[in-house]
């Protein structure tokens, strides 16, 4: 399927609007510090060039690869070295090394100011004045802050963003209409970004075999009526799509994602009865809907797995003939029977099964050796079940904020070397598992909780990789993708950690505390809590609770005072002294 001009091929397949959006996203994800206007200029130049190639595929440079064309364009940015430092050295390289170099310089935590939401009227005016620029700005701002955001999905978010403004800027109460929609888009966007980041980490750090295993398990849960061959085809196609997007090949990725959606909708009968409502929707919505589709019902009377994978005398023969296919079939069969298990648990079971076969198929009596393999699964299954049960009980007892605090203390004790902002961000997100998953029925709790935790812990791994400070974090993040969560769960108080010296400045607060939103206040308090644990890692729950209660009382008192700043100046040192005494 070769084309004389790749850029013309993609322009024709995607259409001008999606082509321009995807190129903007690609450039914004690579050059995260560049001003918006610079990116728009580059995108317009690329688009004009693409149009010349559509008109004549033999025109000059039209035969060049997309990496070459895009890389050449990025390397024309005048301020590359001043803004990006050593990333400018990428431009001295040839493809494909140049693109790899750009990828390595993507920054998961760019030093960009938080996005401030203007007044609704200001936003509506901007939307009406220049809708196209307004939407491009959205793509740019999200893409540069989330350099691995799933590009075709970001186009879907932009379409929803546009629809929200189109509807709400006409409404009687614009704010009441618009703000909840923007909050929902923000929260969904952050979740989507984090989920995609795990997919890219899986591909980049553990290879496509790891990603394919994840996809087999997940798609088998979603499509339990589909044959193994059908699931395998979907997995192959999905792996290609995500490999492309994670590799910066956003045009190919979006094009292949559209092809996959088309294939799924043309073959619904052999995939799932749940696809019908997705397939009537327009492209972006359809692809999103297919990705989020609920699990189909399990077929009736599925046979026992033990017959083929434990009791059969042919297990070792089948395994030896095609190891990955046999393990893939095992994973497919197990996953389609267990929508109640997390994908990570299913992958652990497949790993345990593989290890047993490796050992037993070399033994004198293989059948005798592997006869009890399913019994060995029991502790692996019970561990996440118990973890979910205990943490949901704790969440229900404490509520979200205090549950987050419990996790902050737990994780700071495990890995106190990690930066405070990272510990706060990760623990707050870990704590959100309660509201997200604990209200679900038993059969949905584990897949919700553990697979969500995997996404959050990947964020910790990604941030830690940029600035490594803890061998324990490095070990949990790099040894095994499927065992990351159990690895972190198993970490105890770090006895080797030398407590952080007390710094009064860390615990000095001002009147600006009082004007903060509830969420910002929580973050301030949680930052103080982490610093407290770093200072006194062996502090008991009771001691920490006492200090945090005093802190809340102190802030509340000063925020009610007439002269707030004076109150903070006077009461602050008292609070610090009392806290030190309580923790002595």
């Amino acid at each position: 399927d070769t084309h004389k001009s790749e850029v013309a091929h993609r322009f024709k397949d995607l259409g001008e609007e999606h082509f321009k959006g995807l190129v903007l996203v690609a450039f914004s994800q690579y050059l995260q510090q560049c001003p918006f206007e610079e990116h728009v200029k580059l995108v317009n130049e690329v688009t004009e060039f693409a149009k010349t190639c559509v008109a004549d595929e033999s025109a000059e440079n039209c035969d060049k690869s997309l990496h070459t064309l895009f890389g050449d364009k990025l390397c024309t940015v005048a301020t590359l070295r001043e803004t990006y430092g050593e990333m400018a050295d990428c431009c001295a390289k040839q493809e494909p090394e140049r693109n790899e170099c750009f990828l390595q310089h993507k920054d998961d935590n760019p030093n960009l100011p938080p996005l401030v939401r203007p007044e609704v009227d200001v936003m509506c005016t901007a939307f009406h004045d220049n809708e196209a620029t307004f939407l491009k700005k959205y793509l740019y701002e999200v893409a540069r802050r989330h350099p691995y955001f799933y590009a075709p999905e970001l186009l879907f978010f932009a379409a929803r963003y546009k629809a929200a403004f189109a509807e709400c800027c006409q409404a009687a109460d614009k704010a009441a209409c618009l703000l909840p929609k923007l909050d929902e888009l923000r929260d969904e966007g952050k979740a989507s970004s984090a989920k995609q980041r795990l997919k890219c980490a899986s591909l980049q750090k553990f290879g496509d075999r790891a990603f394919k295993a994840w996809a087999v398990a997940r798609l088998s849960q979603k499509f339990p009526k589909a044959e193994f061959a059908e699931v395998s085809k979907l997995v192959t196609d999905l792996t290609k799509v995500h490999t492309e997007c994670c590799h910066g090949d956003l045009l190919e990725c979006a094009d292949d994602r559209a092809d996959l959606a088309k294939y799924m909708c043309e073959n619904q009968d052999s995939i799932s009865s749940k696809l019908k409502e997705c397939c009537d929707k327009p492209l972006l919505e359809k692809s999103h809907c297919l990705a989020e589709v609920e699990n189909d019902e399990m077929p009736a009377d599925l046979p026992s797995l033990a017959a083929d994978y434990v009791e059969s005398k042919d297990v070792c023969k089948n395994y030896a003939e095609a190891k990955d296919v046999f393990l893939g079939m095992f994973l497919y069969e197990y996953a389609r029977r267990h929508p109640d298990y997390s994908v990570m648990l299913l992958l652990r079971l497949a790993k345990a099964y593989e290890a047993t076969l490796e050992k037993c198929c070399a033994a004198a009596d293989p059948h005798e050796c592997y006869a009890k393999v399913f019994d060995e699964f029991q502790p692996l299954v019970e561990e996440p079940q118990n973890l979910v049960k205990q943490n949901c009980e704790l969440f229900e007892q404490l509520g979200e904020y205090k549950f987050q605090n419990a996790l902050l203390v737990r994780y700071t004790k495990k890995v106190p070397q990690v930066s405070t902002p990272t510990l706060v961000e990760v623990s707050r997100n870990l704590g959100k598992v309660g509201a997200k998953c604990c209200k679900l029925p038993e059969a949905k709790r584990m897949p919700c909780a553990e697979d969500y935790l995997s996404v959050v812990l990947n964020r910790l791994c990604v941030l830690h990789e940029k600035t490594p400070v803890s061998e324990k974090v490095t070990k949990c993040c790099t040894e095994s993708l499927v065992n990351r969560r159990p690895c972190f769960s198993a970490l105890e108080l770090d006895e080797a950690y030398v407590p952080k010296a007390f710094n009064a400045e860390t615990f000095t607060f001002h009147a600006d505390m009082c004007t903060l939103s509830e969420k910002e206040k929580q973050v301030k308090k949680q930052t103080a809590l982490v610093e407290l644990v770093k200072h006194k890692p062996k502090a008991t729950k009771e001691q920490l609770k006492g200090v945090m209660d005093n802190f809340a009382a102190f802030v509340e008192k000063c925020c009610k005072a007439d002269d707030k700043e004076a109150c903070f100046a006077e009461e602050g040192p008292k609070f610090v002294a009392a806290s030190q005494a309580a923790l002595a």
């Epitope: 193994f228 009377d301 046979p303 026992s304 009791e311 059969s312 023969k317």
Partner: antibody, heavy 121, light 111 residues
Framework: EVQLVESGGGLVQPGGSLRLSCAAS????????MGWVRQAPGKGLEYIGI???????YYASWAKGRFTISRDNSKNTVYLQMNSLRAEDTATYFC???????????????WGQGTLVTVSS | IQMTQSPSSLSASVGDRVTITCQSS????????LSWYQQKPGQPPKLLIY???DLASGVPSRFSGSGSGTDFTLTISSLQPEDFATYYC???????????FGGGTKLTVLG
């Protein structure tokens, strides 16, 4: 009543193909491995192959490549696809239910009545 | 893999004790994966014995099986008129592809 009924036999020319079906009633096919055995007129029994509950197939060495066993649990039916048929494939073809689920034990405890396949020009 | 049955034919009278042997060129799986069948003209085979010595459901107790590894025996302790038929052994081996039947023993009425 628990039974197996084969169908699809008949006269076929050498080099031709035929698909035999074996429909189960009174029980679910998904709980046992299902095999095919043939018997040439006046001769002994000859094992063709078996399909396990999970769809793994195992064939006698002489049958590999020409014969394919498949199953459709939703239809409670097992199939035997036979290609490149020769005169020596003339036989009564039986489907049978093995005691095991995942492999062939050689112990078939439920048999169909058989369907006659004649390969002749 | 070869399964050799002997004798290939046998004549006996009602009330006789009859023994048929089956020898495999390789040990059967688990040393006991051997079955015995009875077949009458125009009918499918009927399972008599599995795992060398276990009696199949509904089979009279005059039928018994013994043996291990490569050598097996089917014994009918006291022949009944309905027992005149052809008997086959079948062995399961380490691969399901290698299942094989013996050539058969035709049991007829003496005289």
């Amino acid at each position: 009543e628990v039974q197996l009924v084969e169908s699809g036999g008949g006269l076929v020319q050498p080099g031709g193909s035929l698909r035999l079906s074996c429909a189960a009633s009174g029980f679910s096919l998904s709980s046992n491995a299902m095999g095919w055995v043939r018997q040439a007129p006046g001769k002994g029994l000859e094992y063709i192959g078996i399909i396990s509950v999970g769809g793994f197939t195992y064939y006698a060495s002489w049958a590999k490549g020409r014969f394919t066993i498949s199953r459709d649990n939703s239809k409670n039916t097992v199939y035997l696809q036979m290609n490149s048929l020769r005169a020596e494939d003339t036989a009564t073809y039986f489907c049978a239910r093995d005691r095991h689920g995942g492999d062939s034990s050689g112990a078939f405890y439920l048999w169909g009545q058989g369907t006659l396949v004649t390969v002749s020009s | 893999i070869q399964m050799t049955q002997s004798p290939s034919s046998l004549s006996a009278s009602v009330g006789d004790r009859v023994t048929i042997t089956c020898q495999s060129s390789e040990s059967v799986y688990s040393n006991n994966q051997l079955s015995w069948y009875q077949q009458k003209p125009g009918q499918p085979p009927k399972l008599l014995i599995y795992d060398a010595s276990d009696l199949a459901s509904g089979v009279p107790s005059r039928f018994s099986g013994s043996g291990s590894g490569t050598d097996f025996t089917l014994t009918i302790s006291s022949l009944q008129p309905e027992d005149f038929a052809t008997y086959y052994c079948a062995g399961g081996f380490s691969s399901s592809s290698d299942t094989a039947f013996g050539g058969g023993t035709k049991l007829t009425v003496l005289g």
